[in-house]
Protein backbone atom coordinates (compact mmCIF):
# COMPACT_ATOMS: atom_id res chain seq x y z
CA UNK A 1 0.00 0.00 0.00
CA UNK A 2 1.24 3.47 -0.91
CA UNK A 3 0.68 5.90 1.99
CA UNK A 4 -1.42 9.01 1.29
CA UNK A 5 0.92 11.84 0.40
CA UNK A 6 -1.18 14.29 2.41
CA UNK A 7 -0.93 12.24 5.58
CA UNK A 8 2.48 13.27 6.86
CA UNK A 9 2.32 11.44 10.20
CA UNK A 10 1.47 8.09 8.59
CA UNK A 11 4.30 8.57 6.09
CA UNK A 12 6.80 9.39 8.83
CA UNK A 13 5.88 6.28 10.83
CA UNK A 14 7.04 4.06 7.92
CA UNK A 15 10.61 5.31 8.47
CA UNK A 16 12.72 5.10 11.63
CA UNK A 17 12.80 8.02 14.05
CA UNK A 18 14.59 11.06 12.67
CA UNK A 19 13.78 10.14 9.06
CA UNK A 20 10.82 10.72 6.74
CA UNK A 21 9.62 8.93 3.62
CA UNK A 22 10.62 10.50 0.30
CA UNK A 23 7.47 12.08 -1.20
CA UNK A 24 8.15 10.71 -4.69
CA UNK A 25 9.66 7.34 -3.72
CA UNK A 26 8.23 5.50 -0.73
CA UNK A 27 11.17 3.08 -0.63
CA UNK A 28 13.56 5.89 0.40
CA UNK A 29 13.85 7.28 3.93
CA UNK A 30 15.51 10.69 4.12
CA UNK A 31 17.08 12.21 7.22
CA UNK A 32 15.02 15.05 8.70
CA UNK A 33 16.48 18.56 8.95
CA UNK A 34 17.82 19.80 12.29
CA UNK A 35 16.00 22.56 14.17
CA UNK A 36 16.98 25.95 12.78
CA UNK A 37 16.94 24.57 9.25
CA UNK A 38 14.32 23.62 6.67
CA UNK A 39 14.05 21.18 3.75
CA UNK A 40 15.43 22.63 0.53
CA UNK A 41 15.66 19.34 -1.40
CA UNK A 42 14.82 15.74 -0.48
CA UNK A 43 17.69 13.25 -0.35
CA UNK A 44 18.36 11.85 -3.86
CA UNK A 45 18.69 8.26 -2.65
CA UNK A 46 19.16 5.91 0.35
CA UNK A 47 22.03 6.94 2.62
CA UNK A 48 22.44 10.25 0.79
CA UNK A 49 22.15 13.64 2.49
CA UNK A 50 18.99 15.68 2.66
CA UNK A 51 19.60 19.25 1.48
CA UNK A 52 18.72 21.41 4.48
CA UNK A 53 19.21 25.18 4.60
CA UNK A 54 19.32 27.51 7.59
CA UNK A 55 16.25 29.59 8.32
CA UNK A 56 16.47 33.19 7.20
CA UNK A 57 16.20 36.10 9.60
CA UNK A 58 12.67 36.47 10.93
CA UNK A 59 11.94 32.76 10.70
CA UNK A 60 12.63 29.59 12.71
CA UNK A 61 12.09 25.84 13.16
CA UNK A 62 12.07 24.63 16.78
CA UNK A 63 12.39 20.90 16.15
CA UNK A 64 13.70 18.45 13.55
CA UNK A 65 11.48 18.69 10.51
CA UNK A 66 10.96 18.34 6.78
CA UNK A 67 9.17 21.64 6.29
CA UNK A 68 9.54 23.38 2.94
CA UNK A 69 9.60 26.77 4.67
CA UNK A 70 10.63 27.97 8.11
CA UNK A 71 7.91 29.38 10.36
CA UNK A 72 7.54 33.14 10.72
CA UNK A 73 8.66 34.55 14.06
CA UNK A 74 5.86 35.71 16.34
CA UNK A 75 5.60 39.40 17.18
CA UNK A 76 4.73 40.54 20.68
CA UNK A 77 1.44 42.42 20.68
CA UNK A 78 1.99 45.96 21.95
CA UNK A 79 -1.75 46.66 21.96
CA UNK A 80 -2.11 43.79 24.47
CA UNK A 81 0.65 45.19 26.68
CA UNK A 82 3.04 42.38 25.75
CA UNK A 83 6.81 42.79 25.92
CA UNK A 84 9.58 40.70 24.37
CA UNK A 85 11.23 38.36 26.88
CA UNK A 86 13.60 36.81 24.33
CA UNK A 87 13.99 37.50 20.65
CA UNK A 88 13.48 35.01 17.86
CA UNK A 89 16.42 32.84 16.80
CA UNK A 90 16.64 30.34 13.94
CA UNK A 91 15.66 27.53 16.34
CA UNK A 92 13.32 29.29 18.79
CA UNK A 93 10.30 31.53 18.40
CA UNK A 94 10.01 34.92 20.10
CA UNK A 95 8.99 34.65 23.75
CA UNK A 96 6.49 37.29 24.82
CA UNK A 97 5.43 38.13 28.35
CA UNK A 98 4.31 40.90 30.66
CA UNK A 99 6.10 43.58 32.67
CA UNK A 100 6.85 43.29 36.37
CA UNK A 101 3.73 43.44 38.59
CA UNK A 102 1.51 42.34 35.73
CA UNK A 103 -0.14 39.03 34.91
CA UNK A 104 -1.30 37.31 31.73
CA UNK A 105 -4.99 36.89 31.03
CA UNK A 106 -5.62 34.40 28.23
CA UNK A 107 -8.59 35.39 26.07
CA UNK A 108 -7.98 32.24 24.02
CA UNK A 109 -5.37 29.50 23.80
CA UNK A 110 -2.86 31.66 21.94
CA UNK A 111 -3.90 35.20 22.85
CA UNK A 112 -3.07 36.87 26.14
CA UNK A 113 -3.29 40.39 27.47
CA UNK A 114 -1.22 41.94 30.26
CA UNK A 115 -3.00 43.55 33.20
CA UNK A 116 -1.69 45.17 36.37
CA UNK A 117 -1.76 42.98 39.47
CA UNK A 118 -4.35 44.12 42.01
CA UNK A 119 -2.85 45.90 45.03
CA UNK A 120 -5.68 44.91 47.41
CA UNK A 121 -6.28 48.46 48.68
CA UNK A 122 -8.74 48.32 51.62
CA UNK A 123 -7.93 44.62 51.92
CA UNK A 124 -5.13 42.09 52.28
CA UNK A 125 -3.36 39.84 49.80
CA UNK A 126 -4.76 36.32 50.13
CA UNK A 127 -2.75 34.91 47.19
CA UNK A 128 0.09 36.77 45.50
CA UNK A 129 -0.05 37.72 41.85
CA UNK A 130 1.26 34.94 39.58
CA UNK A 131 2.37 34.82 35.95
CA UNK A 132 -1.10 33.79 34.77
CA UNK A 133 -3.31 34.83 37.69
CA UNK A 134 -4.16 38.11 39.37
CA UNK A 135 -3.71 38.70 43.09
CA UNK A 136 -6.52 37.24 45.19
CA UNK A 137 -7.69 39.84 47.71
CA UNK A 138 -9.58 39.56 51.00
CA UNK A 139 -11.40 42.78 51.88
CA UNK A 140 -11.42 44.54 55.25
CA UNK A 141 -14.68 44.89 57.17
CA UNK A 142 -16.93 47.46 55.55
CA UNK A 143 -15.69 46.57 52.06
CA UNK A 144 -16.73 43.95 49.51
CA UNK A 145 -14.93 42.42 46.53
CA UNK A 146 -16.08 43.63 43.11
CA UNK A 147 -14.02 42.73 40.03
CA UNK A 148 -11.08 41.99 42.37
CA UNK A 149 -11.16 45.42 44.00
CA UNK A 150 -12.29 46.18 47.55
CA UNK A 151 -15.22 48.58 47.30
CA UNK A 152 -16.86 50.39 50.21
CA UNK A 153 -20.13 48.87 51.43
CA UNK A 154 -21.66 52.32 50.96
CA UNK A 155 -21.63 51.42 47.24
CA UNK A 156 -23.56 48.21 47.87
CA UNK A 157 -27.05 48.21 46.37
CA UNK A 158 -29.71 45.83 47.69
CA UNK A 159 -29.93 43.91 44.43
CA UNK A 160 -26.22 43.02 44.38
CA UNK A 161 -24.58 39.97 45.97
CA UNK A 162 -22.63 42.29 48.26
CA UNK A 163 -25.67 42.62 50.54
CA UNK A 164 -24.67 39.36 52.29
CA UNK A 165 -21.12 40.58 52.85
CA UNK A 166 -22.17 44.07 53.86
CA UNK A 167 -25.23 43.05 55.94
CA UNK A 168 -23.45 43.18 59.35
CA UNK A 169 -22.19 46.64 58.43
CA UNK A 170 -25.69 47.77 57.41
CA UNK A 171 -27.17 46.35 60.64
CA UNK A 172 -24.51 48.14 62.70
CA UNK A 173 -25.40 51.40 61.04
CA UNK A 174 -29.09 50.77 61.79
CA UNK A 175 -28.26 49.83 65.39
CA UNK A 176 -26.29 53.02 65.89
CA UNK A 177 -29.17 55.05 64.47
CA UNK A 178 -31.69 53.29 66.76
CA UNK A 179 -29.59 53.79 69.90
CA UNK A 180 -29.20 57.47 69.05
CA UNK A 181 -32.96 58.06 69.11
CA UNK A 182 -33.59 56.81 72.68
Amino acid sequence: LVPHLGDREKRDSVCPQGKYIHPQNNSICCTKCHKGTYLYNDCPGPGQDTDCRECESGSFTASENHLRHCLSCSKCRKEMGQVEISSCTVDRDTVCGCRKNQYRHYWSENLFQCFNCSLCLNGTVHLSCQEKQNTVCTCHAGFFLRENECVSCSNCKKSLECTKLCLPQIENVKGTEDSGTT
Partner: nanobody, 119 residues
Protein backbone atom coordinates in the same frame (compact mmCIF):
# COMPACT_ATOMS: atom_id res chain seq x y z
CA UNK B 1 -21.72 58.30 27.23
CA UNK B 2 -19.94 55.52 25.32
CA UNK B 3 -22.09 53.99 22.59
CA UNK B 4 -21.28 51.14 20.20
CA UNK B 5 -23.88 50.23 17.60
CA UNK B 6 -23.40 47.14 15.44
CA UNK B 7 -25.18 46.57 12.13
CA UNK B 8 -24.93 44.43 9.00
CA UNK B 9 -25.97 41.06 10.38
CA UNK B 10 -28.54 38.84 8.73
CA UNK B 11 -29.26 35.48 7.15
CA UNK B 12 -26.72 34.27 4.62
CA UNK B 13 -26.04 30.97 2.85
CA UNK B 14 -22.85 28.96 3.52
CA UNK B 15 -20.04 30.37 1.41
CA UNK B 16 -21.64 33.81 1.40
CA UNK B 17 -20.34 37.15 2.68
CA UNK B 18 -21.41 39.87 5.09
CA UNK B 19 -19.87 43.13 6.25
CA UNK B 20 -20.51 44.15 9.83
CA UNK B 21 -20.15 47.75 10.97
CA UNK B 22 -19.82 49.24 14.44
CA UNK B 23 -20.55 52.96 14.83
CA UNK B 24 -18.79 54.41 17.88
CA UNK B 25 -19.52 57.59 19.84
CA UNK B 26 -18.94 59.13 23.26
CA UNK B 27 -15.16 58.54 23.31
CA UNK B 28 -12.07 59.24 21.19
CA UNK B 29 -12.36 56.30 18.82
CA UNK B 30 -8.87 56.77 17.33
CA UNK B 31 -7.30 56.29 20.78
CA UNK B 32 -8.77 52.84 21.43
CA UNK B 33 -7.87 49.38 20.10
CA UNK B 34 -11.14 47.64 19.16
CA UNK B 35 -12.37 44.05 19.32
CA UNK B 36 -14.97 41.85 17.63
CA UNK B 37 -16.28 39.08 19.86
CA UNK B 38 -19.12 36.63 19.20
CA UNK B 39 -21.47 34.36 21.07
CA UNK B 40 -22.88 31.30 19.35
CA UNK B 41 -26.20 29.89 20.62
CA UNK B 42 -25.63 28.16 23.96
CA UNK B 43 -21.90 28.96 23.95
CA UNK B 44 -19.61 31.40 25.74
CA UNK B 45 -18.00 34.53 24.31
CA UNK B 46 -15.30 33.96 21.68
CA UNK B 47 -12.65 36.49 20.72
CA UNK B 48 -12.87 36.85 16.93
CA UNK B 49 -10.50 39.64 16.00
CA UNK B 50 -8.95 42.86 17.20
CA UNK B 51 -7.22 45.87 15.68
CA UNK B 52 -4.85 48.46 17.11
CA UNK B 53 -5.55 52.20 17.25
CA UNK B 54 -4.23 53.01 13.78
CA UNK B 55 -5.39 49.85 12.00
CA UNK B 56 -1.89 48.50 11.47
CA UNK B 57 -1.75 45.46 13.77
CA UNK B 58 -4.56 42.93 13.62
CA UNK B 59 -5.28 39.57 15.21
CA UNK B 60 -7.62 36.77 14.10
CA UNK B 61 -8.78 33.64 15.89
CA UNK B 62 -7.67 30.48 14.07
CA UNK B 63 -11.32 29.67 13.31
CA UNK B 64 -11.71 32.80 11.12
CA UNK B 65 -8.16 33.36 9.82
CA UNK B 66 -8.07 33.87 6.06
CA UNK B 67 -11.85 34.41 5.86
CA UNK B 68 -12.50 37.49 8.03
CA UNK B 69 -10.89 40.93 7.77
CA UNK B 70 -11.06 43.58 10.47
CA UNK B 71 -10.58 47.25 9.58
CA UNK B 72 -11.42 50.68 10.91
CA UNK B 73 -12.05 54.19 9.62
CA UNK B 74 -11.04 56.64 12.34
CA UNK B 75 -12.43 59.59 10.35
CA UNK B 76 -15.88 57.92 10.47
CA UNK B 77 -15.53 56.47 14.00
CA UNK B 78 -16.43 53.07 12.56
CA UNK B 79 -15.11 49.54 12.98
CA UNK B 80 -15.73 46.88 10.31
CA UNK B 81 -15.64 43.11 9.98
CA UNK B 82 -15.66 41.70 6.46
CA UNK B 83 -16.79 38.07 6.65
CA UNK B 84 -16.23 35.83 3.62
CA UNK B 85 -16.69 32.09 3.02
CA UNK B 86 -19.16 31.94 5.89
CA UNK B 87 -19.85 28.61 7.57
CA UNK B 88 -22.70 27.32 9.73
CA UNK B 89 -20.38 27.50 12.76
CA UNK B 90 -20.04 31.28 12.27
CA UNK B 91 -23.69 31.64 13.34
CA UNK B 92 -23.60 33.90 16.41
CA UNK B 93 -24.37 37.32 17.81
CA UNK B 94 -21.41 39.56 16.96
CA UNK B 95 -20.40 42.35 19.32
CA UNK B 96 -17.85 45.12 18.98
CA UNK B 97 -16.06 46.28 22.10
CA UNK B 98 -13.30 48.55 23.33
CA UNK B 99 -10.21 46.54 24.21
CA UNK B 100 -10.22 46.26 28.03
CA UNK B 101 -7.51 48.18 29.87
CA UNK B 102 -8.02 47.84 33.62
CA UNK B 103 -8.93 44.16 33.83
CA UNK B 104 -10.21 41.16 31.88
CA UNK B 105 -13.77 42.36 31.40
CA UNK B 106 -15.58 44.27 28.68
CA UNK B 107 -16.75 47.55 30.19
CA UNK B 108 -17.96 48.89 26.84
CA UNK B 109 -19.60 46.80 24.14
CA UNK B 110 -22.57 47.05 21.84
CA UNK B 111 -25.96 45.32 21.76
CA UNK B 112 -24.79 42.94 19.04
CA UNK B 113 -25.94 41.95 15.56
CA UNK B 114 -27.09 38.42 14.71
CA UNK B 115 -25.40 36.53 11.88
CA UNK B 116 -27.15 33.34 10.77
CA UNK B 117 -25.43 31.07 8.25
CA UNK B 118 -27.89 28.52 6.91
CA UNK B 119 -29.03 27.03 3.63
Amino acid sequence: EVQLLESGGGLVQPGGSLRLSCAASGFTFAHEPMVWIRQAPGKGLEWVSHIDRVGQDTYYADSVKGRFTISRDNSKNTLYLQMNSLRAEDTAVYYCAILPKRGPRFDYWGQGTLVTVSS
